[in-house]
């Protein structure tokens, strides 16, 4: 059998001779040189050489355990004379013994970490790790202990884990944001003679909302012209907050003051300013100065810092309304006037009134905007605003006249304003009724008496208040001995009736009936219209067959009778 134990070899040997490893030995070896020892495997013949007679193994080079901790070799023992193996070919190992020749090395040269400001003592920040290439299973060469070289009293490090924690209460970012901590890792359990390495940890305190917004001044004053329309920005105020980001966001609001309804404040998200804007129309003549109480507050508040006081601040904003030379103001937004259509020229219709709203109360003059009254039908007294006609009117031509009146300050013609006038022309009975259409009808030769041959309709351009009431009659000159009669239906229509049985077209082929149409208004208006009646041959159904004159084309819907 082989007679050996495990071979051990100290790393980093610095002697001048080869380093002795150990001896391969067979119990068959009688010491007479009859056996030959053969070495093969890891580093055989190069790193490790064997005396083939004695079995002594030596290392020819300085070995580094951290490069290779174990070498696996094979041993043979052969009878020199016969060449027969006297021992089985066997593996054995040479284990390289560790010395403390490696310092701990941190996984990063520089660590960066963050921790919220005002954190409790003992809050985890970051864990640093150092590794030691030496043998962790043997001695303390790789037993690493962490300590803090720089960064006290703010931070501490757990000696075994490398966990860095906060060590000081109320670390305030607004006071100091950056810390550079130097951590040492030392092997040999931190004992004297141990090797060490260091790393830098750059720690940044992140912001928490521990500061309220603060106005830099207690009072602000702004001016704005009374003419500023709603939405006009009139000034900016800015509260400052020592925090950053979301924690420094500010919302502005108006909490009190006579200007509460007249002004708004909006927050500019980019600049974090409060913009005071006009909410309602201002009037210098009514109120010249407004006072507002504006509040700046953090929308996101951390409850644990509420003990520091309210996270808001107030300031007074004084707004001075500046006078603006305003145009005259009419007493009404629009005027509606009426006038009879038979009014004479220079008839006064009504009047308009405008006043300068300014304290100066400048006098005004009136004029008609001629673009709205091209025909110069109306005029205005420039001094008192009276409107009068300058031409005759006709309701039937134009019912409404829409004109614009201008009021201009005499001392400052640039200041003017306009108002619409709606003038309604009232009806006068100045038009006679007349036939709605031209009537031409026929009567059958064999017609019977009192037969309806045509219904008459009338129209009137006038528009009486109580509606039209027309009356129809034959003209006096045709009333006696007429072959036809007019029957007034009392509904603004009338019928033409036959007055005899039978007509002879050879005797009389055409009748002309003069019909008088009158209205019932004041003064009464009437007109005479003529209805042409032709005598025609008809079939037994009453349908026209032939007339002496050209064929009749009579309007649809007319009842001709049978």
């Amino acid at each position: 059998s082989w007679m050996w134990n495990q071979f051990f070899l100290l790393e980093e040997y610095t002697g001048s001779d080869y380093q002795y490893v150990g001896k391969l030995h067979s119990d068959q070896d009688r010491g007479d040189g009859s056996l030959k020892y053969i070495l093969s495997g890891d580093g055989a013949g190069d790193l490790f050489i064997i005396n083939e007679n004695t079995g002594d193994i030596q290392a020819t080079k300085r070995l580094d355990r951290e490069e290779k901790p174990v070498y696996i070799l094979r041993a043979q023992a052969i009878n020199r004379r016969t060449g027969r193996p006297v021992e089985p070919e066997s593996e054995f190992i040479i284990k390289i013994h560790d010395i403390n020749d490696n310092e701990p090395i941190f996984t990063k040269e520089v660590y960066t970490a963050t921790v919220p400001e005002m954190s409790d003592v003992g809050t985890f920040v970051v864990q640093v790790t150092a590794t030691d290439a030496d043998d962790p299973t043997y001695g303390n060469s790789a037993k690493v202990v962490y300590s803090i070289l720089q960064g006290q009293p703010y931070f501490s490090v757990e000696s075994e884990t490398g966990i860095i924690k906060t060590a000081l209460l109320n670390m305030d970012r607004e006071n100091r944001e950056q810390y550079q901590v130097v951590i040492q890792a030392k092997d040999m359990g931190g004992q004297m003679g141990g090797l060490s390495g260091t790393t830098t940890v750059n720690i940044t305190l992140t912001d928490v909302n521990d500061n309220p917004p603060r106005f830099p001044q207690s009072t602000y004053q702004f001016k704005t012209p009374e003419s500023s329309p709603p939405g006009t920005p009139i000034g900016r105020i800015k509260a400052s907050d020592a925090d950053v980001g979301e924690n420094a966001e500010i919302e502005y609001s108006i909490t009190d003051g006579e200007g509460l309804d007249m002004f708004d404040v909006i927050t500019d998200q980019e600049t974090q300013e409060g913009i005071i804007t006009v909410k309602k129309l201002l009037d210098f003549e009514k109120k010249k100065v407004y006072t507002l109480k504006v509040e700046a507050s953090n929308p996101y508040v951390e409850p644990r810092f509420l003990y520091l006081g309210p996270f808001k601040d107030s300031a007074t904003v004084r707004i001075v309304v500046e006078d603006v030379d305003e145009p005259p103001v009419f007493s009404k937004l629009a005027y509606i006037l009426q006038i009879r259509e038979d009014a004479q020229i220079n008839t006064t219709i009504g009047s308009v009134t405008a006043q300068d709203p300014d304290a100066a109360r400048n006098p005004v003059k009136y004029s008609v905007d001629r673009h709205t009254d091209m025909d110069r039908i109306f005029n205005i007294d420039s001094g008192n605003g009276s409107i009068f006609t300058s031409k005759l009117l006709d309701r039937e031509t134009l019912l409404w006249h829409n004109i614009t009146v201008i009021a201009t300050e005499i001392n400052n013609p640039k200041q003017s304003s306009r108002v619409p006038l709606y003038i309604k022309v009232l009806d006068v009975n100045d038009n006679a009724p007349e036939f709605a259409e031209f009537y031409e009808t026929f009567v059958c030769e064999k017609a019977k008496a009192d037969q309806l041959i045509q219904t008459l309709h009338a129209v009137d351009k006038d528009d009486p208040y109580s509606g039209h009431q027309f009356s129809f009659s034959l003209a006096p000159e045709a009333a006696s001995g007429s072959n036809f009669t007019i029957q007034d239906n009392k509904d603004n229509t009338a019928g033409i009736l036959t007055r005899k049985n039978g007509y002879n077209r050879h005797e009389m082929s055409t009748y002309l009936l003069p019909v008088v149409i009158s209205d019932n208004d004041y003064p009464v208006q009437s007109s005479t219209g003529t209805v042409t009646v032709r005598v025609c041959a008809c079939d037994h159904h009453g349908n026209m067959q032939s007339c002496h004159a050209e064929a009749l084309i009579h309007p649809t819907g007319l009842s001709t009778g049978a």
Epitope: S1, W2, I72, Q76, P85, P88, S90, E91, F92, I93
Partner: antibody, heavy 118, light 107 residues
Framework: EVKLVESGGGLVKPGGSLKVSCAAS????????MAWVRQAPGKGPEWVAF????????YYADTVTGRFTISRENAKNTLYLEMSSLRSEDTAMYYC???????????WGAGTTVTVSS | DIQMTQSPASLSASVGETVTITCRAS??????LAWYQQKQGKSPQLLVF???LLADGVPSRFSGSGSGTQYSLKINSLQSEDVARYYC?????????FGAGTKLELK
């Protein structure tokens, strides 16, 4: 007396597993490499696997790589062959053999029979 | 892989005769060759290793020779107990391979 005794053979279904053992006595077990050699009925021997004395070197035949695992317990003077995903062609007498120098077999056990059949 | 070709597959000889079995490797195996004897129902036994060296307890009528790719096993003065199958095996590199065997019978 140098002796190798195999055990654990038997009948197993295709796809099944089996672990056979070899108990060594009469020599310094930890000085020797060991091997498994099998012999199908009517055929010549076929090398299966080798393990060096300290188990740093292990080799397998291509036909069993990935399915068979050779191992040893020097403290117990025992060699093992764990077989999985067995096939009908794995049916054979399995011998445990001692290796003397670079893979020749100077001592053989009597063998254990492994039959793979459904 | 190295193939081992053994011949003859079988042979008959009389007691006292000399018998030679040959084995050819598909490539140079540098004398890393062993011969085994396997009797009916038994496990193989080592006869020769390193091509020429007899294993302990093997009768001297057995001898091995050869080099490179050609090897042979010679049995002088054949005995009745020599009836068996004979296998060659190379151990030059893995995978280790055996020859198909030679069956030796008595006439």
């Amino acid at each position: 007396e140098v002796k190798l005794v195999e055990s654990g053979g038997g009948l197993v279904k295709p796809g099944g597993s089996l672990k056979v053992s070899c108990a060594a006595s009469g020599f310094t077990f930890s000085d020797h490499g060991m091997a498994w050699v099998r012999q199908a009925p009517g055929k010549g021997p076929e090398w299966v696997a080798f393990i060096s004395n300290l188990a740093y070197s292990i080799y397998y035949a291509d036909t069993v790589t990935g399915r068979f695992t050779i191992s040893r317990e020097n403290a117990k003077n025992t060699l093992y062959l764990e077989m999985s995903s067995l096939r009908s062609e794995d049916t054979a007498m399995y011998y445990c053999a001692r290796v003397y120098v670079k893979w020749y077999f100077d001592v053989w056990g009597a063998g254990t029979t492994v039959t793979v059949s459904s | 892989d190295i193939q081992m070709t053994q011949s003859p597959a079988s042979l008959s000889a009389s007691v006292g005769e000399t018998v030679t079995i040959t084995c050819r490797a598909s490539e140079n195996i540098d004398s890393y060759l062993a011969w085994y004897q396997q009797k009916q129902g038994k496990s193989p036994q080592l006869l020769v290793f390193a091509a020429t060296l007899l294993a302990d307890g093997v009768p001297s009528r057995f001898s091995g020779s050869g080099s490179g790719t050609q090897y042979s096993l010679k049995i002088n003065s054949l005995q009745s107990e020599d009836v068996a199958r004979y296998y060659c095996q190379h151990y030059y590199s893995t995978p280790l391979t055996f020859g198909a065997g030679t069956k030796l019978e008595l006439k």
